[in-house]
Every structure is written in C-alpha cells, then in structure tokens.
C-alpha cells in the first residue's frame, strides 16, 4: 500500500500526477467525504493513471454476490475484485470519465472496448450504467446494452427479463434481457470455456458461448 498519510487521492489519475507512477494498491478517498477505499492503479497501460474497477483472471473470487457487496466492493485489489458501485458512481458524477475494458481469450488474443464517456447513476437509480463513444477492437457494437440498464444482483433483480438474469447467469451486471455481456459470470478454465451460457461473456468479440480468460475494467478522467 503506497498511500502517504497526508495524501488524499480521489482516483489513480491523481495518484499518478502526484508522482506515484508504480503499479499497485493505493488508498483512494470518496469525493466530498473522508471515507476511503483501496484500489489497484495501473500506472503503465496507455499512459497510466487508470483506476481498476474490476478484474477477473483465475476464478479465485466468487462474483455471485449480494447488492450490498457489489455496492461496497469485494475481492482483493491485487487479484480478482470489484471496486464498488457506490465509489464508482460518486467518482464518475464528479467529472467526465472514460472506461476501458480489456479482454483476453484462451488462445492468446487480446482486445479492448473504450467508451469515451462513462458514469453510473446513483443507488437510487440502481447504479444504471451510461456509456457513449465506443471505439476499440472488441466489437463495433457495444456488448453492454445501450442506453444502459440498471445493475442487478442475485438479491436485486432490476433487469428487463422475467427470468432473473443475475440468478440464471450468475454475477452482478447491467443485464438487459439478459443482454450480450456479463464480465462477472462464472469463471471457466481452459477447455471448459465453450458453450457456456453463464460464463464471462463479451458477445461482440467472442460470441455467446465463449467464456473469457481474463478481463479488466478501468476508468480514468477524460482530461488526463
């Protein structure tokens, strides 16, 4: 943990600009609050300053969690984790953020989707996701349905399907009915990762039944 006691950083971009340019876990402070949260900062990719808000890489963390757990975050910032919807909502309503989603398949390929505008609505509005300005190599159509859906978990069903997507597909996500993606689905190891309806899905890159090897969701201020 690289936080200095006197430093107050809202995101990894502020950490980077303060001179801390090494990848690692830093303590961030909620906007307009003294509440703190630990996050992994990627200080190397694409110029650095990225706040990692989600990571899947080995199946070591269970992502079939409750609304409250997705709200406050869970897992280990140095490995698989979810940073927390409340922090991300507060942060992305302060200024304009970009969202980059980096994906790896089991054949050694990598791809990304970059959204030039990203924010989450408040909890009152079920942390609805808002995305605009898609570019990248992981599909010309957004695998997160647009305009964004409300967030759903196993105990908080806000999707557009009578089927309860979060229970059926596992994991909390911005499900439609149920939609073309779920990066918080079941982790399937190699050779068990095809024809899986409830895996880690990004439809417009790998199709509906392919479960990915690794995913990272990261945000950074647009004016970084």
């Amino acid at each position: 943990d690289y936080k200095d006691d006197d430093d107050k950083f809202r995101d990894c971009a502020e950490v980077f600009k303060s001179g801390h340019t090494t990848n690692g876990i830093y303590t961030l402070t909620f906007p307009n609050s003294t509440e703190e949260i630990k996050a992994y900062c990627d200080m190397e990719a694409g110029g650095g300053g990225w706040t990692i808000i989600q990571r899947r890489e080995d199946g070591s963390v269970d992502f079939q969690r409750t609304w409250k757990e997705y709200k406050v975050g869970f897992g280990n910032p140095s490995g698989e984790y979810w940073l927390g919807n409340e922090f991300v909502s507060q942060l992305t309503n302060q200024q304009r953020y970009v969202l980059k989603i980096h994906l790896k398949d089991w054949e050694g390929n990598e791809a990304y989707s970059l959204y030039e505008h990203f924010y989450l609505s408040s909890e009152e509005l079920n942390y609805r996701i808002h995305l605009k300005g898609l570019t990248g190599t992981a599909g010309k159509i957004s695998s997160i349905s647009q305009p964004g859906n409300d967030f759903s978990t196993k105990d908080g069903d806000n999707d557009k399907c009578a089927c309860k997507c979060s229970q059926m597909l596992t994991g909390g996500w911005w499900f439609d009915a149920c939609g073309p993606s779920n990066l918080n689905g079941m982790y399937y190891p190699q050779r068990q990762n095809t024809n899986k309806f409830n895996g880690i899905k990004w439809y417009y890159w790998k199709g509906s039944g392919y479960s990915l090897k690794a995913t990272t969701m990261m945000i950074r201020p647009a004016d970084f």
Partner: antibody
Framework: DVQLQESGPGLVKPSQSLSLTCTVT?????????WNWIRQFPGNKLEWMGY???????SYNPSLKSRISITRDTSKNQFFLQLNSVTPEDTATYYC??????????????WGQGTSVTVSS | SIVMTQTPKLLLVSAGDRVTITCKAS??????VAWYQQKPGQSPKLLIY???NRYTGVPDRFTGSGYGTDFTFAISTVQAEDLAIYFC?????????FGGGTKLEIK
Amino acid sequence: DVQLQESGPGLVKPSQSLSLTCTVTGYSITSDYAWNWIRQFPGNKLEWMGYISYSGSTSYNPSLKSRISITRDTSKNQFFLQLNSVTPEDTATYYCARSTFGHYVSSMDYWGQGTSVTVSS
Amino acid sequence: SIVMTQTPKLLLVSAGDRVTITCKASQSASNDVAWYQQKPGQSPKLLIYYASNRYTGVPDRFTGSGYGTDFTFAISTVQAEDLAIYFCQQDYSSPPTFGGGTKLEIK
C-alpha cells in the same frame, strides 16, 4: 410517463430576449439525464441549442454561446431558456427534450410538443 | 462541428415498398447516431439510437445500421402512416448535429 411542456410568448421583438419554460412531469430533472432545448426553423432544419444536466451543469451550442442561458427551478421541476438579442432569424419552433445521457449530448427520447416563436416588430 | 449529409431529400414511394435513407458524417461519429420520425404537426420521435438499436415500441420494419461515417436507415415495408420527415442526428461530439431531413411521401 415522462411529459415535457413548453410555454412562453409567441411573439418577441427584435433585440429583446426570448424566454421559454419547460415543465417536466413524471420524472425529476435532478435524478438523471440532460434536459435540452432544440429549435426547428421554417424549412424543417433542426438545431440543438444546449442542455442543463441533472447535476446542474450546462452545455451550449458554440454558435449561440454568447446569447444563450439555460437555468432551472428544481422545486417546480422546470428548466428555462433565455436567448438574448434576438433577430428575425431566431423565428422557429422551440422544443424541450430529455436526452438519454446525463453528462454529454445524446439522442433524445422525450420531446415536448413545441412552441412557435416569431421575432418581429 | 460534424456535418451530417442526409440523402435523399425526398422519397416518393408506394405502400409496401422498401426505402433506404443514408447519412454521411463529415468525420467519425462512432455508433452515436440516432434517427427520428416527425409526422406533420408533431414533434420528432426517436426511432433508432446508437445506430442500430430500435427504441421501445418502434415496429421492427424500422432498422438502422452503420459505424464511423456511413449510416443507413431503412423501412422494410412502407405503410401509409409512415408519411413523415426522417432526420439523422450524431451525438458523438458536441454540438450534436442533425441531417437536413428526408421527406417521405406516399404515392
């Protein structure tokens, strides 16, 4: 259901200010989304004028920036357009509309019925 | 500003025909393009957003496609009630800008 209703004078004299009100029902303008003014000139050309977001931030069309102001009254769930120093070229039908994104320009899913404004002496 | 060049300006069609309208952006608009229908005496209505997504309640005879600079809107089987002006709009960059409109007239 979300409804938007424009109101204001139908006739404004040149060099004066045009002031319009948009009253929103069925959704709080402080909850989410951006709240826009768009105008349609005779001949059907559409022009986005600007918005006020749910957080209160504003964005204006650079072609109007020196003349336009969009404000709101959250207690009445209304937002307002003021356009200064009008000329006959500002004669148009003025619409208010909600866009599907709160921090930037976007497509607009709910529109008012429009109010016709003529600038003439 | 991104200029949206919409063609044609007028479409004279018969009920049952398939029609296609195109919009060309002066620079990339990603997939941030919407299509609106404006019937006589009414305000514009959103039909398509993010280039290809049909808005709630819009019949499936209306479709959109495209990415970058070239966008297409189609009505697979024109009906009498489709008489209207159709507009494209980019909202990739500010200010958002509209095409000049295509007037659809039924023979």
